[in-house]
Each structure stands twice: as structure tokens, then as C-alpha cells.
């Protein structure tokens, strides 16, 4: 019998490399059974995760999973950092793994590094 616990499927030690000025959607995959839990996003500041208030969020439904989406419209250099989603389920808090946004502040599209260049940067791989 499948567990009816809420599960948040953000991959452990995942990251996204994005560019300032672009729109970006950060997705929190949520598995639940009967009632969709209340889900929030927070941004890590040291060991504290600061709840993101007043941000544009939405839900997307797929076959076996729902996604709670945090919208960046557009991405700002200050959005660099690690994020976590958490769900309120039966008065318990379930926390996801954190996922990291690496924001590149580029002046124009012609200056954008390729994905290979991004992948070869030690600061990107080991921050």
C-alpha cells in the first residue's frame, strides 16, 4: 500500500544556473493523496530559512504530481542562493531539500556563457 504522506521531490543537492533579467519558474514537486497541503517557499540565510511573502506563486497539476511554483519575473542578481519548499500536513511541517539558484548577471545576450562554460566553473560546481 502506497504511503499517503506528503512528499516534496526537490532533488537533493540540485542547482539551476539562470540569468538576471530572464523569467524563471522554480518548481516544487508535491505528492499528496486526498487534500492538497499548504506549501510555502523560503530562502536560506545561513541556517535559517526565511519565508518568502508576497511573491507570485502558482500550482501546476500533472498526472501523478502537483508542482508549487515560485515565479521570478524577472530574475534579479539578489535571487542568487538556496531555496526550500515546505508543506503543512496534518499540523506537521515537511521540508524539501534545498535547491540552489546560481544567478549570472550579464549585460547582454551576446555575453552569455554556454552551458559547457557554466559547467566548467569551479564556483558553480562547488559553491
Amino acid at each position: 500500500k502506497e504511503s499517503c504522506d506528503v512528499q516534496l521531490y526537490i532533488k537533493r543537492q540540485s542547482y539551476h544556473s539562470i540569468f538576471a533579467g530572464d523569467p524563471f519558474k522554480l518548481e516544487c514537486p508535491v505528492k499528496y493523496c486526498a487534500h492538497r497541503p499548504q506549501v510555502t517557499w523560503c530562502k536560506l540565510n545561513g541556517t535559517t530559512c526565511v519565508k518568502l511573502e508576497g511573491r507570485h506563486t502558482s500550482w501546476k497539476q500533472e498526472k501523478n504530481l502537483s508542482f508549487f511554483i515560485l515565479h521570478f519575473e524577472p530574475v534579479l542578481p539578489s535571487d542568487n542562493g538556496s531555496y526550500r519548499c515546505s508543506a503543512n500536513f496534518l499540523s506537521a511541517i515537511i521540508e524539501s531539500h534545498s535547491t540552489t539558484l546560481y544567478v549570472t548577471d550579464v549585460k547582454s545576450a551576446s555575453e552569455r556563457p554556454s552551458k559547457d562554460e557554466m559547467a566548467s566553473r569551479p564556483w558553480l560546481l562547488y559553491s
Epitope: 543537492q13 540540485s14 542547482y15 531539500h97 534545498s98 552551458k115 559547467a119
Partner: antibody, heavy 120, light 112 residues
Amino acid sequence: EVQLQQSGAELVKPGASVKLSCTDSGFNIKDTYIHWVTQRPQQGLEWIGRIDPANGFTRYDPKFQGKATITSDTSSNTAYLQLSSLTSEDTAVYYCAREDGYPYYTLDCWGQGTSVTVSS
Amino acid sequence: DVVMTQSPLTLSLTIGQPASISCKSSQSLLDVDGKTYLNWFLQRPGQSPKRLIYLVSKLDSGVPDRFTGSGSGTDFTLKISRVEAEDLGVYYCWQGTHFPRTFGGGTKLEIK
């Protein structure tokens, strides 16, 4: 049983490149990470790196940076390892392995390995 | 990099004897999520590695309960209560906490 099927053995000349493949027949690779591990003759296991097929982002052991390039194609559920500027030191068996994701995050399923021999 | 040091290099045992393999890491393997991503693999001759134990002490399905994993922080142990012929091969510890991921050098179990 979930299987990772790797491409066949390769005999390549020094200085050449080779691209190995790893196809997951039972699991959507977008949902996890695919790792590559190497084993030189009579030696232990060494981690090369991993890819997140959902977005193509990679992490490598710095000692393989520039030598190995990991890519994936989610339409065919396949991950690839390209090895460049091959030398006799690159003669080894190369394994792909799948990380099983939530909640254990370990290498639960391995391919059968691809033998690469670098020889003139 | 996190260095994983296994000992002994070789174990030569008779059927029914107990076995103990040590794995020490150069840094703590306790992750920020409170879990310790220390795993044990067995590579039988001519085969791919096979996962035996994950998260220090959890046995993979199909692994006999004569295998036990223990430890925390930087010191870990794999024990076999009574060695059987099918246990021969090379045992590797592997850490999945830090990048780059690293394996121990391996411990070869021979049956006398």
C-alpha cells in the same frame, strides 16, 4: 528488474575520443541523477561525475574535468560519457549508475560496464 | 576531497568465520539534512558493483541479515557474522554527502 544498458566495448587509438551510452529501460532519467564511475585494470572504483537529466547540469571530480563530458537525452532515456584526448591511462571499464532519489540518494542500480581499451 | 580509507586491504577467511571491514572518512559524512550518506558495495569477480547497505545501516532488499553496517561521523564498519562462499569479492565504501563523491580503496574478501 530495472536495468541500465551500456554500449559495447571500444578499442580506440591514442588521441581519439569515444562516447559511451547508458540507457535506462525502467525509470525516467529526468527523475534522478545518472553517475559515471571508472575502474582501471586491477584497481578500485573512481567517481567521474553525475548529470541531472532534467536540466543537463553536471558535477565532476576535478581530476576528470576536461577529460570527461557527461550529457543526456531524455527523449531516449539515455546518458552519455564522452572521453577526449585518450591515452593508455584511460584504458578502463566505465560504469553508469543511477541514484535512486528520495529518500536514500545512493547508487542503487548499475550498468554492466563498458570496456575501453586505448591502444595504437 | 573527502578521503575514504578502508582497512584491511585483504581478508582471507574460512566459511563461517566473522568478517569486519573499517571505513574512515577524512570529514564527517553527516549531511545538513541530518542523514549520513555512507554506502557499502560489493563487486564480485567479473561483475558490476552491487549495493549492499545505504544510509550507514539499511540493508538493500535481498541482502542477507548476516550483513550489518554501523558507525557515524567519520568511522564506519561493515560486519559479516558468518562468511559464506558467495560473499567473496571486493567491498567498497562510498560517501554521497560531499562533492566530489569518493570511494574507499576496497577490501578484498578471499575464501580460504
